[in-house]
Interface confidence: low
């Protein structure tokens, strides 16, 4: 014998107790296919959440979120703090993308740099914190008169490599030489503060540049998790 | 033939109680909710509620809480209503109908039984 | 309550003419069903679930509309179709009819 509640459509319940028949769904339900011995709740949207679609007795309820959050989740099962361009959001609020990073939407974290030279290209424009960085043609490209059929090379100048050689290397023997410098005097400075303390009346106690620009930065450690920040769940 | 026979016209004067019969026929009783409907003469159909015939429940519309009692005599494939404290306003045709798993509508109606309150 | 409004209340028409009447609901509903109803009778079962015609219904009678509007319409009237017609809702307690319209013969 077929079962009389398969006659019921959407927007219908059937409930053997009440003579087998299609009842309509009460005030703030729906059914959305045939059949249904319930209706369900329709669904609210309330506080962060507006309604997008209003429920029908045939449809649920659809939510969005009010202005400055983002729907996440199926369904917009979760609304979502916007940050600017250029931050992400952090168990803290919104942080501005640390060095090396963007971001170019509101929400969303901060993805690093395309890394150019992995590619065998040259930064052409530099990257932000809302815009990553654009790739231009290689190295080699960027010499003159280079074109994209190479034309015979040219006689060249018995020293011509000779010369580039030698001027490479006084390069990073200047760099080397500098980076020693630095450090030296580093230890120095740290050998001096130990010894005569008294010189230095507020040893570095003033916060920074640097510690406030890291601080207001979201370079996660590794154990604070993404997401979790500024967000309303249905 | 699937029918719905009504008793016959009422005259009633006010403060009375009246009892209209609806013998249902040809059709399983029990499966089928059945409705009352009002007509006042020249006036539109107001739906008074219905009984469930499967559990003997009761509704009845707003406008027909506290005097209207819908019951059931299951072995007789019988439904009644019942008006108690008959008022003018309660004259009347009043039709029983049979009402369909889906859609909610009625195909088959008594032929209505005509009540009339006057003093 | 859902309260269905019909338009007009009486109307006249001669043979062969087109008719239409309309039904307002309050709240929108999913379907409308109309009813029949000739002088002294019970009422039949004109159009259920807003455009399907009821058993022995002539084709020359149609109905249509959606949400909170809904139409009956007699492609060319015949002094048959003399009678009160009465929208009808069963989308939600309580069920509710419209006040009916009275269709008369010019």
């Known amino acids: 014998l077929q079962d009389p509640c398969s006659n019921c459509p959407a927007g219908t319940f059937c409930d053997n107790n009440r003579n087998q028949i299609c009842s309509p769904c009460p005030p703030n339900s729906f059914s959305s296919a045939g059949g249904q011995r319930t209706c369900d709740i329709c669904r609210q949207c309330k506080g962060v959440f507006r309604t997008r679609k209003e429920c029908s007795s045939t449809s649920n309820a659809e939510c969005d979120c009010t202005p400055g959050f983002h729907c996440l989740g199926a369904g917009c099962s979760m609304c979502e703090q916007d940050c600017k361009q250029g931050q992400e959001l952090t168990k803290k609020g919104c942080k501005d993308c640390c060095f090396g990073t963007f971001n170019d939407q509101k929400r969303g974290i901060c993805r690093p740099w395309t890394n150019c030279s992995l590619d065998g290209k040259s930064v052409l424009v530099n990257g932000t914190k809302e815009r990553d960085v654009v790739c231009g043609p290689s190295p080699a490209d960027l010499s003159p008169g280079a074109s994209s059929v190479t034309p015979p090379a040219p006689a060249r100048e018995p020293g011509h490599s000779l010369q580039v050689l030698t001027l490479f290397l006084a390069l990073t023997s200047a760099l080397l030489l500098a980076l020693i410098f630095i450090t030296l005097l580093f230890s120095v400075l740290k050998w001096i503060r130990k010894k005569f303390p008294h010189i230095f009346k507020q040893p570095f106690k003033k916060t920074t540049g640097a510690a406030q620009e890291e601080d207001a930065c979201s370079c996660r450690c590794p154990q604070e998790e993404e997401g979790g920040g500024g967000g309303y769940e249905l | 033939q699937i029918q719905l026979v009504q008793s016959g016209p009422e005259l009633k004067k006010p403060g009375e109680t009246v009892k209209i019969s609806c013998k249902a026929s040809k059709f399983t009783f029990t499966n089928y909710g059945m409705n009352w409907v009002k007509q006042a003469p020249g006036k539109a159909l107001k739906w008074m509620g219905w009984i469930n015939t499967y559990t003997g429940e009761p509704t009845y519309a707003d406008d027909f809480k506290g005097r209207f009692d819908f019951s059931l005599e299951t072995s007789a494939t019988t439904a009644y209503l019942q008006i108690n404290n008959l008022k003018n306003e309660d004259t009347a045709t009043y039709f029983c109908?049979?009402?369909?798993?889906?859609?909610?509508?009625?195909?088959?109606w008594g032929q209505g039984t005509l009540v009339t309150v006057s003093a | 309550e859902n309260v269905l409004t019909q338009s007009p209340a009486i109307m006249s028409a001669s043979p062969g003419e087109k008719v239409t009447m309309t039904c307002s609901a309050s709240?929108?509903?999913?379907?409308m069903h109309w009813y029949q109803q000739k002088s002294s009778t019970s009422p039949k079962l004109w159009i259920y679930d807003t455009s399907k015609l009821a058993s022995g219904v002539p084709g020359r009678f149609s109905g249509s509309g959606s949400g909170n509007s809904y139409s009956l319409t007699i492609s060319s009237m015949e002094a048959e179709d003399v009678a009160t017609y009465y929208c009808f809702q069963g989308s939600g307690y309580p069920l509710t009819f419209g006040g009916g319209t009275k269709l008369e013969i010019k």
């Open positions: 709240s929108s509903v999913s379907y």
């Open positions: 109908a049979r009402r369909e798993y889906y859609p909610w509508v009625f195909v088959y």
